[in-house]
């Protein structure tokens, strides 16, 4: 898919990797929270 206009911002280039890592970390935390919630509901 086409890159959004913000990809032209130098910041996008310099922080691309760390932002992707931060997002992955956030998703992992969300998944962990969801699992915990399912465990509680499942009981």
């Amino acid at each position: 898919s086409e890159e959004p206009p913000i990809s032209l911002d130098l910041t996008f280039h310099l922080l691309r990797e760390v932002l992707e890592m931060a997002r992955a970390e956030q998703l992992a935390q969300q998944a962990h929270s969801n699992r915990k919630l399912m465990e509680i509901i499942g009981k």
Epitope: P4, P5, I6, D9, L10, T11, L14, L15, A22, R23
Partner: antibody, heavy 118, light 112 residues
Framework: EVQLQQSGPELVKPGASVKMSCKAS????????MKWVKQSHGESLEWIGV????????FYNQKFKGKATLTVDKSSSTAFMQLNSLTSEDSAVYSC???????????WGQGTLVAVSA | DVLMTQTPLSLPVSLGDQASISCRSG???????????LEWYLQRPGQSPRLLIY???NRFSGVPDRFSGSGSGTDFTLKISRVGAEDLGIYYC?????????FGGGTKLEVK
């Protein structure tokens, strides 16, 4: 003309929180990241963090994790920064800034003075 | 964190003279993409910082050609030929090659 208009000065008590704003105009708000910078009185500049107005992705300078919270409101082209558990060390001028395809801090807001005092 | 050290702390000049400000980084600030993200800013009294130079030696739009940046690796210089009253203030170098991004401590350009 690119303009970043920041909210007015704040006098707050230790332990309290403060939320300041930065209203962008003269460009498409979602086309550029918004950064925040701290300048303590008579001292140098410190980069706090950056937010992508498109999707809310945020990256903080480790030093300011837990101290600053960055958000945006796309409908009003406004970026916000909240500072919590304030101490005298947080007394400073806080500025928002925007980059370009070539540089990181090409356009600056006028700054918001935060004074923490009992 | 990459420490950016500026010298001198204060630089008294006569208007019309040339001024030279040094900035040294604690480690190389060549980015993995080959570029060096070294920028220079001027903060006039009571104002917000203003971008002068990006990527070591490129003048930002509207910046007069009396401002020039040079250097590589860890050593960088900002030169101002024919200093005018509007050039007085605090100059900061900045690196965006390594996270966290960091600024130098500043050099105050003032009238002798």
């Amino acid at each position: 003309e690119v303009q970043l208009q920041q909210s007015g000065p704040e006098l707050v008590k230790p332990g309290a929180s403060v939320k300041m704003s930065c209203k962008a105009s003269g460009y498409t708000f979602t086309d550029y990241f918004m950064k925040w910078v701290k300048q303590s009185h008579g001292e140098s500049l410190e980069w706090i963090g950056v937010i992508n107005p498109n999707n809310g992705d945020i990256f903080y300078n480790q030093k300011f994790k837990g101290k600053a919270t960055l958000t945006v409101d796309k409908s009003s082209s406004t970026a916000f920064m909240q500072l919590n558990s304030l101490t005298s060390e947080d007394s400073a001028v806080y500025s928002c800034a925007r980059g370009t395809d070539r540089a990181l801090f090409a356009y600056w807001g006028q700054g918001t003075l935060v004074a923490v005092s009992a | 964190d990459v420490l950016m050290t500026q010298t001198p702390l204060s630089l008294p000049v006569s208007l019309g003279d040339q001024a030279s400000i040094s900035c040294r980084s604690g480690q190389s600030i060549v980015h993995s993409d080959g570029n060096t993200y070294l920028e220079w800013y001027l903060q006039r009294p009571g104002q917000s910082p203003r971008l002068l130079i990006y990527k070591v030696s490129n003048r930002f739009s509207g910046v007069p050609d009396r401002f020039s940046g040079s250097g590589s690796g860890t050593d960088f210089t900002l030169k101002i030929s024919r200093v005018g009253a509007e050039d007085l203030g605090i100059y900061y170098c900045f690196q965006g090659s390594h996270i966290p991004w960091t600024f130098g401590g500043g050099t105050k350009l003032e009238v002798k």
